[in-house]
């Protein structure tokens, strides 16, 4: 029975050219995390495998950094980075848990005027 829940940073915004940390946290379960996949829509960005470490997609290697923890840091943000991101926790023995984050990358002038999403 899957008892765990995924907590995420929810809806977030960041400035173009800046960086952001995508963070998910699995709680309320004793399941062992075998691997976390980070995906943008249907594209695999990176994985963190408990036994084998981090692997970052070559397409994003220059702009994606592993961590902190099981999170993912996106750097040199562009407007095209706006969209949904998913953390997929493969656990034993529970199975798969998925968390969703929506990132909006704003032009720096807009961001300075506080047009930001509220994190729930």
């Amino acid at each position: 029975m899957m008892t765990g829940t995924i907590e995420t940073t929810g809806n977030i915004s960041a400035e173009k050219g800046g960086s952001i940390i995508l963070q998910c946290h699995l709680s309320s379960t004793t399941a062992q995390v075998t691997q976390v996949n980070w995906e943008q829509q249907d594209q695999l960005l990176a994985i963190c495998n408990a036994d084998l470490g981090w692997h970052i997609s070559p397409s994003f290697k220059d702009r994606v950094a592993p961590g902190p923890g099981l999170g993912l840091t996106l750097q040199s943000l562009t407007v095209n980075d706006t969209g949904e991101y998913f953390c997929i926790y493969h656990t034993y023995p529970d199975g798969t848990y998925t968390g969703r984050i929506f990132l909006e990358v704003l032009e720096s002038s807009v961001a300075e005027h506080g047009a930001r999403f509220q994190i729930p």
């Epitope: 691997q35 695999l44 036994d51 084998l52 692997h55 070559p58 493969h90």
Partner: antibody, heavy 121, light 110 residues
Amino acid sequence: EVQLLESGGGLVQPGGSLRLSCAASGFTFSSYYMSWVRQAPGKGLEWVSAISIFSGDSTYYADSVKGRFTISRDNSKNTLYLQMNSLRAEDTAVYYCAKSHTVLQYGMDVWGQGTTVTVSS
Amino acid sequence: QSVLTQPPSASGTPGQRVTISCSGVTSNIRNYYVSWYQQLPGTAPKLLIYGNDQRPSGVPDRFSGSKSGTSASLAISGLQSEDEADYYCGTWDNTLNAWVFGGGTKLTVL
């Protein structure tokens, strides 16, 4: 349809080399760990090697082949390779290419038909 | 010698239920999911069970898997002549940092 097709097997003398290939189709090749598994005549399955997703910068080997075999991948060609050097009689086997589950530790969900390697003088 | 231990052979008559065991240790079976593979004579292995007890599409529900502690088992009910094959269990071992298989069990349908 997900398919794996091995090639490159054959007869080779002890101490010789051989390069196996595995052409993949029907799935996003770069997003999966891939493995080689072998089966000696009349024997069971033996995992040989695996390679990480994406650029394949991490590789894993059974102790029996460490230092002699090299696994690699070319994502632009959807192809997995196994370079086998310093071959021994005990390397004689059918070699299978296998696609791993999204998580390597969860096993292999698709197998090729195999290619036969015979090491003999 | 294989890291996972399976009986070398098993047999049953058509319609019977047969169970094949697979024994390991904490660094493999206890900590990870177990898969089962079927190898019909002269063919490549095929995934039969993954995630301890999950069947891929196309695998009949006569095949079932289970796991408890450091052991796993494959049960085949309503045995049929076409089930005659070699069966292998497999899992990850985090001490070896390698995938490991059982030695295989040859199932004979009498």
